[in-house]
């Protein structure tokens, strides 16, 4: 029962995590204009992995895609790659884990196969979560570097009458969504691996061996292992885990058309 619950919970947590990774990857607010010195700005800039946007105080928002592939920074390309790999691995992991769930019966699939599939999906979730965390962290590091570089530039070349205020960017909402989502996927993967450990040893089917002692007819079954194949039906109770009735509230709140102080 505990194994089923751990497996089911791992699946749900991973599902939420992967949904979060997808959301973070698609979001435009990976980096947002730093408003430390100017809390109410007439023109607000923010950037995502795929496009950059400008929101005017009038409410008009214009987004432009990065229509070049070669002209983009290598780091941005790397972040994109990490996030996409994370999504792909996570999606495959979800697909595998659906069939691995104890509460779902598919033909005469053995528990050992389910254990292997649970482990496979768990590893996939762990790698997926690590990819997302790595991608977000690389982008965050890039932001921090650029932030301090632009801060240094802001205080140079101010000798003339005309001031050119450089736009500085700070962490956007997508980074926090990505970190949390990556963490959840990682936790879900670990839970799947733990569930696999619970499934594997106990669920491995061994044929019972008969030992004939003199004068007695004793059927010896090795302790700790369950006799199943070739010895009648598996009588262990299977509890059905209802993992589909759960609904998760939308956590990410997107900025409204007008954000005022």
């Amino acid at each position: 029962m505990a194994v089923t619950a751990c497996q089911g919970l791992g699946f749900v947590v991973s599902l939420i995590g992967i949904a979060g990774i997808i959301a973070a990857t698609c979001m435009d607010q990976w980096s947002t204009q730093d408003l430390y010195n100017n809390p109410v700005t007439a023109v607000f800039n923010y950037q995502g992995l795929w496009r950059s946007c400008v929101r005017e105080s009038s409410g008009f928002t214009e987004c432009r895609g990065y229509f070049t592939l070669l002209g983009l920074p290598a780091m941005l390309q790397a972040v994109r790659a990490l996030m996409i790999v994370g999504i792909v691995l996570g999606a495959i992991g979800l697909l595998v884990s659906i069939f691995a769930l104890k509460c779902i019966r598919i033909g005469s699939m053995e528990d050992s196969a389910k254990a292997n599939m649970t482990l496979t999906s768990g590893i996939m979730f762990i790698v997926s979560g690590l990819c997302a965390i790595a991608g977000v962290s690389v982008f965050a590091n890039m932001l921090v570097t650029n932030f301090w570089m632009s801060t240094a530039n802001m205080y140079t070349g101010m000798g003339g009458m005309v001031q050119t205020v450089q736009t500085r960017y700070t962490f956007g909402a997508a980074l926090f969504v990505g970190w949390v989502a990556g963490g959840l996927t990682l936790i879900g993967g670990v839970m799947m691996c733990i569930a696999c450990r619970g499934l594997a040893p106990e669920e491995t089917n061994y044929k019972a061996v008969s030992y004939h002692a003199s004068g007695h007819s004793v059927a010896y079954k090795p302790g700790g292992f369950k006799a199943s194949t070739g010895f009648g039906s598996n009588t262990k109770n299977k509890k059905i885990y209802d993992g589909g009735a759960r609904t998760e509230d939308e956590v990410q709140s997107y900025p409204s058309k007008h954000d005022y102080v």
Epitope: A42, V43, Q47, S52, Q163, H258
Partner: antibody, heavy 118, light 113 residues
């Protein structure tokens, strides 16, 4: 087509306050900022501030923060500006305007002339 | 606050001539995010509110005659009327739409000979 109708001219005594209105039509009132601009022969055009009727959020020019109060009534699609402690410096034409692309003002009211008498 | 300086304060031209007026800002009005300049030009005739002519420094508002054009970037901007007409007699203002508080130039008064 957006249209802004402002209230009539006001003659007020020094030290008193005045409240003028700006009735909007032809667009969704709660979706756009209403800005207020002061015009005097001496200082030209000066931006006072704006109100976003959707949530009542305001942003003032620091120069006018203690002088002007912006409000809006969504039920009548009307924006209001109250100017307090009037002095001769406050004698001007006050315009309301709706914002547009590039943080510009595409639609303007006809203006409200405020004359402060001693 | 961003200071907007317009020049000349007034100019007199003959109908049909090309006219240019300048607007300079104390800070750059160019937004790096979309490479647009947040400068607006208005025309104001006596007894009327200002009328929007050009936004984003060079985008002409619909209904504005194509003889009006805006140019410039960063801190230096120009409004050009390719062939002045009698109805263009007015005061022309530039406005900063990049940083609060929004500020206007003192205006350039266009008169006809």
């Amino acid at each position: 087509q957006a249209y802004l109708q402002q209230s009539g001219a006001e003659l007020v005594r020094s030290g008193a306050s005045v409240k003028m209105s700006c009735k909007a039509s032809g667009y969704t009132f709660t979706s756009h900022n209403i800005h207020w601009i002061k015009q005097t022969p001496g200082k030209g055009l000066e931006w006072i501030g704006y109100i976003y009727p959707g949530n009542g959020g305001t942003n003032y020019n620091q120069k006018f923060k203690a002088k002007a109060t912006l409000t809006a009534d969504t039920s009548s699609s009307t924006a209001y500006m109250q100017i307090s402690s009037l002095t001769s410096e406050d004698s001007a034409v006050y315009f309301c305007a709706r914002d547009y692309y590039g943080n510009s003002f595409a639609y303007w009211g006809q203006g409200t002339l405020v004359t402060v008498s001693a | 606050d961003i200071m907007m300086t317009q020049s000349p304060s007034s100019l007199t031209e003959t109908a049909g001539e090309k006219v240019s007026m300048s607007c300079k800002s104390s800070q750059s009005l160019l937004n790096s995010g979309n490479q647009k300049n947040y400068l607006t030009w208005y025309q104001q005739k006596p007894g009327q509110p200002p009328k929007l002519l050009i936004y984003w420094a060079s985008t002409r508002e619909s209904g504005v005659p194509d003889r009006f054009s805006g140019s410039g970037s960063g801190t230096d901007f120009t409004l050009t009327i390719s062939s002045v007409q009698a109805e263009d007699l007015a005061v022309y203002y530039c406005q900063n739409g990049y940083r609060f508080p929004f500020t206007f130039g003192a205006g350039t008064k266009l008169e006809l000979k």
